[in-house]
């Protein structure tokens, strides 16, 4: 392991479309991939009239957008579906939205999801 880098071994798993996709609904996912490549966790969610609806959480393959991010934060301004990725086991348990272009307060507080 490279010093100072959080290795991602496991991620929180959630799939709102678990029946259609024929997967588990919730759990912990072990992350697999090429041994020399980095692994990350991700979370996706929607903000429906101020209510957070998780779409998916799980493992994410080597992506420079996620390097050295210990927190799962979406920075894109007003996406249709929010997406964040991070490094470190279970780092996708909490996720938040801080749009990069905004100088005002973030539109949502950090979220600790509680799947229905």
């Amino acid at each position: 392991a490279i010093l100072g880098r959080s290795e991602t071994q496991e991620c929180i798993f959630y799939n709102a479309n678990w029946e259609r996709d024929r997967t588990n609904r919730t759990g912990v996912e072990s992350c697999y991939g090429d041994k020399d490549k980095r692994r990350h966790c991700f979370a996706t969610w929607k903000n429906i009239s101020g209510s957070i609806e998780i779409v998916k959480q799980g493992c994410w393959l080597d992506d420079i957008n996620c390097y050295d991010r210990t927190d799962c934060i979406e920075k894109k301004d007003s996406p249709e579906v929010y997406f964040c990725c991070c490094e470190g086991s279970m780092c996708n348990e909490r996720f938040s939205y801080f749009p990069e272009m905004e100088v005002t307060q973030p539109t949502s507080n950090p979220v600790t999801p509680k799947p229905p």
């Epitope: 493992c59 393959l61 080597d62 992506d63 894109k76 996406p79 579906v81």
Partner: antibody
């Protein structure tokens, strides 16, 4: 093992559209991007666009903006690339590739545009 | 999103070393470690050889190495072998906030 299997060759008339599919297996489809690249006969590789299958977020090369649409169906682990308003210069082999590093590629789909 | 610049062709004898350059700008080649190298044999799909400037893809011989200086990346193949004869492309990571771009390709001939 990771595999990306693309749909078969297509022949289209100028002005029409084509939709190429890319079915992924051997890994979790929602764990990385799918990129689309094309290669005209005797020419180099040309990046067309990318999709994050889990969020549906897409980015397209300026050259193809407005003419290309990339989608993904997570229930079948399949990505699609649709190119509209076809012209003869769009005759090429179209490839899908996994991830930001393009570490696995489909076998390619030849699209011929001819009147 | 201009194409990266590569020499059209390079050649070398078996056992020799060759270097292929790939020149871009500060927003593609010069930005972070985004550069990859691909090998393509005639009629085949490209194959990832080097990613992140200098990391060898699994299964790629250590005769292949990558480096970068400023806005120019380089692929060096040492101990040339006949099967190395192919087209080589540089390209950048694509996904999220990053757009992709490829070089025009370099034909490597093993004499």
């Amino acid at each position: 093992q990771v595999q990306l299997v693309q749909s078969g060759a297509e022949v289209r008339k100028p002005g029409s559209s084509v939709k190429v599919s890319c079915k992924a297996s051997g890994y979790t489809f929602t764990s990385s991007y799918i990129n689309w690249v094309r290669q005209a006969p005797g020419q180099g590789l040309e990046w067309m666009g990318t999709i994050n299958p889990v969020s549906g977020s897409t980015s397209y090369a300026q050259k193809f903006q407005g003419r290309v649409t990339i989608t993904a169906d997570t229930s079948t682990s399949t990505a699609y690339m649709e190119l509209s308003s076809l012209r003869s210069e769009d005759t090429a082999v179209y490839y899908c590739a996994r991830g930001g590093w393009f570490d696995y590629w489909g076998q390619g789909t030849l699209v011929t545009v001819s009147s | 999103q201009s194409a990266l610049t590569q020499p059209r062709s390079v050649s070398g004898s078996p056992g020799q070393s060759v270097t292929i350059s790939c020149t871009g700008t500060s927003s593609d080649v010069g930005s972070y470690n985004r550069v990859n190298w691909y090998q393509q044999h005639p009629g085949k799909a490209p194959k990832l050889m080097i990613y992140g400037v200098s990391k060898r893809e699994s299964g790629v011989p250590d005769r292949f190495s990558g480096s970068k200086s400023g806005n120019t990346a380089s692929l060096t193949i040492s101990g040339l072998q006949a099967e190395d004869e192919a087209d080589y492309y540089c390209g950048t990571f694509a996904g999220g906030r990053y757009y992709g771009v490829f070089g025009g390709g370099t034909k490597l001939t093993v004499l």
